[in-house]
Structures are given as structure tokens and as C-alpha cells.
Interface confidence: medium
Amino acid sequence: HQTYRRHCRPEESTFSAAMTTMQGMEQATPGAGPGVPQLGNMAVVHSHLWKGLQEKFLKGEPKVLGVVQILIALMSLSMGITMMCVAFSAYGHYPISVYIGYTIWGSVMFIISGSLSIAAGIRTTKGLVRGSLGMNITSSVLAVSAILINTISLTIYSFYHRYCNYYGNPNNCHGTVSILMGMDGMVLLLSVLEFCIAVSLSAFGCKAICCTPGGVVLIIPSNSHMAEAAPLTPLNEV
């Protein structure tokens, strides 16, 4: 029987099944000391673990969510560009969200996140899953910032509904403010969706990456008197 270090909760791990199979694999490797499994077999086990974790990641539908992420980012980008065109043509004040330009740099980040998620869904390598996870965590933080920015923006900008034609506008000032507030609201909604998708993809990415056995596995052979002789075997990533 074995004891091993877990990197995630038992119910999230495929180690149990994989480690059980290791009992049948224990063979004496010449000169390696008793009770030590062959390194070749360890690599096979690790490959088997990664396969299971790959499946966990793919359960999160990274390709579908990545496409949705890109579509939302493109919608947000088009909203932002439209808002900028409407706002800058008006002689007066415009929403903070336009001034900060979140819709531009936020959308670029979400497009990168989505692209990495799609790539990780097509070719599930650790590098791509890691990249996707990193970008989606960043996107989650950005989406939270965007939600805050847009909420403040809407609150402040609604104040100008009272004052808007103080500065005047060749078109109906209140109409312009209403359009900008509506679009700001839409960007807020899209930011909430982006946050949900980024968090979801991060969660599935984390299940795959954070649960990878990158630590030390302690093999304890069945004959307990030999326990002291069993070395600590690191499981190298493949």
C-alpha cells in the first residue's frame, strides 16, 4: 500500500485509480533497491494521470467558451468604438468607461484569453493549459475591474442627464446621454458574462494544472520492515 501527497481534493483527483495500478507494477529494478518501481513505469503512470486531467479540462468546454469569450470581446469592442464615436463627436462630457478606454484594452485581453482557451482545447498541452489559465485569471481580474468601472461610470454619467445640455450637443443631448448610458449598461452586462466565462475556464484549467502530481510521491512497499529503504521518488513532468 502507498501514501502520497495530494495537490487537490480527493474527489478531484485521478491519483487514486492510478496509484492502485502501481501496486501491480512494483518490480525490483536491478541495483535500485527493493520496493522501488521502474522509472519507465512511473512515466507511464504520469502520462496516464495527465490524460485523466486533460479530460477534466476538456469537460469545461474550453473551445466553446473560448469562442464565446472572443464573441463577447468583439461585441464589447464594437460597443466601445461606437461609444467613443458618439462621445467624442459631442461637445461635452462622456462616460468614465470611454475615458479609461476599457472596452479597447479589456477586449484585447479577452480575445487573447479566448484564443488560448481554444488552442488549449484543440491541443491540450500543459503549456497551453497554463497559458490559458494565466490569461483567464488575468481576464477575471480585468472583468471585475470593468464591472466596477462601468458601475461607477453609469452612476456618475446618470448625473449628467440633468446637466447634459449645459454643454450643448448638436444632436439631442439627452438622446446622446441615453444612448451612451444604454451602451455603458450593455458593456457592464458583457463584463459580467466575461467574468463568468473567465472564472469557469480558470476553474477547469486549475483542476488540470493544480492537480498535476508535480510534488514528491512516497512509495511505501507492502512489507513494512523495508519502509526505511524506500527512497523518495520525484515524479518529473512530461
Epitope: 461635452g92 446637466y163 447634459c164 445640455n165 449645459y166 454643454y167 450643448g168 450637443n169 439631442n172
Partner: antibody, heavy 114, light 112 residues
């Protein structure tokens, strides 16, 4: 072309009420707020406040709260300045102007004298 | 309210000479939308004021390019490169950054 045309000169006694009009033309009336500016003889310009021509909400400068009232007649593209309980120091020329001070009325001289 | 301080009070120039008027505000006139709401107006004798410059340096239509506005934050200047007889009158700076706009005290331009 854009024009702001004000009502003619006024001569009033202290304690009376005056209503000065400012008729706008040449642009969409509800798209630009209108300000009222007071100029006493030989003195500078003093902003009295403005009215949102879309919502009709007036905003008054601190020195012009109480006896002063701005109102609208949107259908006639006209804004009004009403001064109640006139005092001698209300004697001045009153201008209406678009809030960005880009267009001005010709001014309405008001004389308050007993 | 924002206080606008104009200097000098009176400016005497000969025709063809240049003239410069300064305007200082008690707080920055740069708004969060990136625009600086400062205008220059001219009130000729017996007339209503006329806006010459808006957003610090933009000339209103029909205003000769002899007039130039400059400055940022709290310090602004109006320059008239070659003064003409029609330029005499009182010049005012105006701020519209808050919803209680204010005017400078005025600078009277006289012809020597």
C-alpha cells in the same frame, strides 16, 4: 442663423416684478441649456444660473437664489427670467446666452427706480 | 465656485502692436473628459459679448487668426498679434468646468 432675441428695456419701481424673455431660433432649442448673465453699469459679467431647456430644471448661482426664477415655454423656444420684489441694485442689463457662451442675446436693460 | 483672475485691468496699445491678457483660475480647468473649458469673450462698447475662443485655443468662426489662446491647467493667455481699431473693448475669460460657470473681471483694451 442662430439668434437669441430678448424683450425690450424695462423701467420698474422697487417691490414690483419683471419678466424678461429670450427667444431662440436657428437651432434645436432643447439641445442647448440657456444661461442668464447680469451686467451692472460699468461692471463685469455675473452668471446668474442656467436652465436645462430639455427638462426645464433651473440651476441658480448662490447670489441669485430666492427672488429670481427661470422658466421655459418650449413650444415657443423661449426662456424667461422673472425677478420678484425688485430692488434698486437690480438695475442692470440682463443677457441670455447659450450655456457655452457661444451665442448671446442683445441684452435687456432694467431700471429700478422710485 | 472657481475664481477667475484677469490681468491687467486696462491695456493701452497702439494699432499694429501686439497685446497679451492673462487669466488665472483658482483650480484646474481640465475636466475628466480631457477638455479644458476656458473661453475668451470680447464685449465691444454698447454691444453684447461675443465669444472669440473656446476650449483654450479654438477660434470661433469669423474670428481673425490674429487672436491666439494658449495655456493649460490654471494659467491661460490671450494674445492679439496686430491690434486693430475694431479690437477695442473689454475682454473676459470664462470657465465652464463646473455647473456654476464664472467670468474673469475683464480687461479693457484701449487704443493709444
Amino acid at each position: 442663423q442662430i439668434q437669441l432675441v430678448q424683450s425690450g428695456p424695462e423701467l420698474k419701481k422697487p417691490g414690483e416684478t419683471v419678466k424678461i424673455s429670450c427667444k431662440a431660433s436657428g437651432y434645436i432649442f432643447t439641445s442647448y441649456g440657456l444661461s442668464w448673465v447680469k451686467q451692472t453699469p460699468g461692471k463685469g459679467l455675473k452668471w446668474m444660473g442656467w436652465i436645462n431647456t430639455y427638462s426645464g430644471v433651473p440651476t441658480y448661482a448662490n447670489d441669485f437664489k430666492g427672488r429670481f426664477a427661470f422658466s421655459l415655454e418650449t413650444s415657443a423656444s423661449t426662456t424667461y427670467l422673472r425677478i420678484n420684489n425688485l430692488k434698486n441694485d437690480d438695475t442692470a442689463t440682463y443677457f441670455c446666452a447659450r450655456s457655452l457662451v457661444d451665442y448671446w442675446g442683445q441684452g435687456t436693460p432694467l431700471t429700478v427706480s422710485s | 465656485d472657481v475664481v477667475m483672475t484677469q490681468t491687467p485691468f486696462t491695456l493701452s496699445v497702439t494699432i499694429g502692436q501686439s497685446a497679451s491678457i492673462s487669466c488665472k483660475s483658482s483650480q484646474s480647468l481640465l475636466y475628466s473628459d480631457g477638455k479644458t473649458y476656458l473661453s475668451w469673450l470680447l464685449q465691444r462698447p454698447g454691444q453684447s459679448p461675443k465669444r472669440l475662443i473656446y476650449l483654450v485655443s479654438k477660434l470661433d468662426s469669423g474670428v481673425p487668426d490674429r487672436f491666439t489662446g494658449s495655456g493649460s491647467g490654471t494659467d491661460f493667455t490671450l494674445k492679439i498679434s496686430r491690434v486693430e481699431a475694431e479690437d477695442l473693448g473689454v475682454y473676459y475669460c470664462w470657465q465652464g468646468i463646473d455647473f456654476h460657470q464664472t467670468f474673469g473681471g475683464g480687461t479693457k483694451l484701449e487704443i493709444k
